[in-house]
């Protein structure tokens, strides 16, 4: 249907029970007036799942959809639903006259708009085929996990599925990593969820006969704050020859800003521990994680005095973690010595 002056479905009477979807091509700048139901009990108009306000340039008012002057952003799917129910009275798509591709239909190729996709009667409105798989409505998922929502359905003609997030059309274009829509599985998949993915996800399943919808509520749990985590096995026990260079590595993971120190255990008056039970240590290096190479302790031209226990100590606002390693320094003539060193520790 291509109109030249005003797109109008009149009169505003009881709707036809044949809910065939219509496509209307509208020229830019053209006024639109569509009616749905009787004026005094007209249905509510929705665009892409969002109800139109009774005022504004594009408005839904007393059963009428009115657009003062059609703009490219007005193209899309419009539904009129009967008051007090989800019965679809009108189901149509407005297409910009000079751009037939603006119908924004990237849906399942089996869409009922495909003229080659003719269906045998009787027609049947969409229905859920596995409602028991949809029972879990509320989802709380740790950040970084994958979420999959499914709305398996059937009907005749074969329905299409669209997804809304918080009532708005959802294609994932603003989501890092995007989304996967698997129409043959009636599913929406989001990988590596983040807090901004929280919301209400609605699957909207439609065919020419009717539509059904289902909401999933998603909460994303941020990682709980923790003291720094040190990669197991680092720093590693190391054997070096006098005069060589040594690197001790400490890999620190922390959400909160960590502070890192490299310590060398020393002996004072023949003792390794003070009266308080803590070891005597010498601070060799201290910095925040964003300092360059703070996670590496470089020992140049090592001597026998450099042998001993070294500790990587990492702390943040939540707590401390440390792991230790032993450096064994061999005289140049005997590079075959190996040591059974104590295990690395990870404590509060």
């Amino acid at each position: 249907l291509e109109a030249s002056e005003e797109v109008e479905l009149e009169p505003c009477l009881a709707p036809s029970l044949e809910q065939q979807e219509q496509e209307l091509t509208v020229a830019l700048g053209q006024p639109v007036r569509l009616c749905c139901g009787r004026a005094e009990r007209g249905g509510h108009w929705y665009k892409e799942g969002s109800r139109l306000a009774p005022a504004g340039r594009v408005r839904g008012w007393r059963g009428r959809l009115e657009i003062a002057s059609f703009l490219p952003e007005d193209a899309g799917r419009y539904l009129c639903l009967a008051r007090g129910s989800m019965i679809v009275l009108q189901n149509l798509t407005l297409i910009t006259g000079d751009s037939l591709t603006s119908s924004n239909d990237d849906e399942d190729p089996k869409s009922h708009r495909d003229p080659s996709n003719r269906h045998s009667y009787p027609q049947q409105a969409p229905y859920w085929t596995h409602p028991q798989r949809m029972e879990k409505k509320l989802h709380a998922v740790p950040a970084g996990n994958t979420v999959k929502f499914r709305c398996p359905a059937a009907g005749n003609p074969t329905p299409t599925i669209r997804w809304l997030k918080d009532g708005q059309a959802f294609h994932g274009e603003n989501r890092i990593g995007g989304i996967r829509l698997r129409h043959q599985h009636w599913s929406l998949v989001m990988e590596s969820v983040v807090p901004s993915d929280r919301g209400t996800y609605t699957c909207l399943v439609e065919n020419a006969v009717g539509s059904i919808r289902y909401n999933y509520l998603l909460d994303v749990l941020e990682r709980s704050p923790h003291r720094p985590i040190l990669q197991a096995g680092l720093p590693a026990n190391t054997t070096a020859v006098v005069g060589s260079d040594v690197e001790l590595l400490c890999k620190v993971y922390s959400d909160a800003q960590p502070h890192i120190q490299w310590l060398k255990h020393i002996v004072i008056n023949g003792s390794s521990f003070g009266a308080d039970g803590f070891p005597y240590v010498q601070v060799l290096k201290t910095a925040d994680i964003n300092s360059s190479e703070v996670e590496v302790l470089y020992l140049r031209n090592v001597s026998a005095e450099d042998a001993g226990e070294y500790t990587c100590l990492a702390g943040n606002s939540i707590g401390l973690s440390y792991q230790s390693a032993w450096l064994t320094v061999l005289p140049e003539e005997d590079p075959t010595w190996t040591a059974a060193a104590p295990e690395a520790r990870y404590t509060d």
Epitope: Y46, G49, R51, L81, M86, W128, P131, M134, E135, K136, K137, L138, A140, G167, P195, R198, G199, T202, I212, R213, Y214, N215, L217, L218, D219, V220, L221, E222
Partner: antibody, heavy 119, light 111 residues
Framework: EVQLLESGGGLVQPGGSLRLSCAAS????????MAWVRQAPGKGLEWVSV????????VYADSVKGRFTISRDNSKNTLYLQMNSLRAEDTAVYYC????????????WGQGTLVTVSS | QSVLTQPPSASGTPGQGVTISCSGS????????VNWYQQLPGAAPKLLIY???LRPSGVPARFSGSKSGTSASLAISGLRSEDEADYYC????????????FGGGTKLTVL
């Protein structure tokens, strides 16, 4: 034993504010969706709001949207309902309820706290 | 006006059976499971039936639930005086502006 104990109700003038609390015990509070449900005197139950375990996901009934705020402090095992711009029709007993994580029903309810909005 | 429709009252004599209906639409009962809550006089609501027909521990087998299409029902057999209470059906609603909807409640009187 799961226990939910509401507090903070009372008499408030129209346009005033009130904050309800719900102290939870007997379960791992931080892993559950929670809700507020209210019941006007002599009337039926009306759902008010739901909050996710993180506190970052909330939904509200149209009748309170923009006026009420649901929140939680998982470190204190406490659910809150901040009620602003109160109206006479908000007069009700307010219940906090735990939502079952499997099939999303309200499996435990508190005893309720009465909020009266009157001049 | 409640979204789910229940009869305002029901009654029966001790030992009798009674059924309470709950009618909804495709966006609530049609797509979601139904739960029933019992509210004894002066008390908070208590879960009675969940997922259409399941009983929490501690709820007697005299209480049973069922669902068909966009309607549900609660059946109570062998009525006892302590069953006198208000009974509410509830379901999640996938309509455009709703989340959880309740029936208006049915006052059960044991004569």
């Amino acid at each position: 034993e799961v226990q939910l104990l509401e507090s903070g109700g009372g008499l408030v003038q129209p346009g005033g504010s009130l904050r309800l609390s719900c102290a939870a015990s007997g379960f791992t509070f931080s892993t559950y969706w929670m809700a507020w449900v209210r019941q006007a005197p002599g009337k039926g139950l009306e759902w008010v709001s739901v909050i996710g375990p993180s506190g970052g996901m909330t939904v509200y009934a149209d009748s309170v949207k923009g006026r009420f705020t649901i929140s939680r402090d998982n470190s204190k095992n406490t659910l809150y309902l901040q009620m602003n711009s109160l109206r006479a029709e908000d007069t009700a007993v307010y219940y906090c309820a735990r939502i079952n994580s499997g099939s999303s029903h309200f499996d435990y309810w508190g005893q309720g706290t009465l909020v009266t909005v009157s001049s | 006006q409640s979204v789910l429709t229940q009869p305002p009252s029901a009654s029966g004599t001790p030992g009798q059976g009674v059924t309470i209906s709950c009618s909804g639409s495709s966006s609530n009962i049609g797509s979601n499971s139904v739960n029933w809550y019992q509210q004894l006089p002066g008390a908070a609501p208590k879960l009675l039936i969940y997922s259409n027909n399941l009983r929490p521990s501690g709820v007697p087998a005299r209480f049973s639930g069922s669902k068909s299409g966009t309607s549900a029902s609660l059946a109570i057999s062998g009525l006892r005086s302590e069953d006198e209470a208000d009974y509410y059906c509830a379901a999640w609603d996938d309509g455009l502006d709703a989340y959880v909807v309740f029936g208006g409640g049915t006052k059960l009187t044991v004569l």
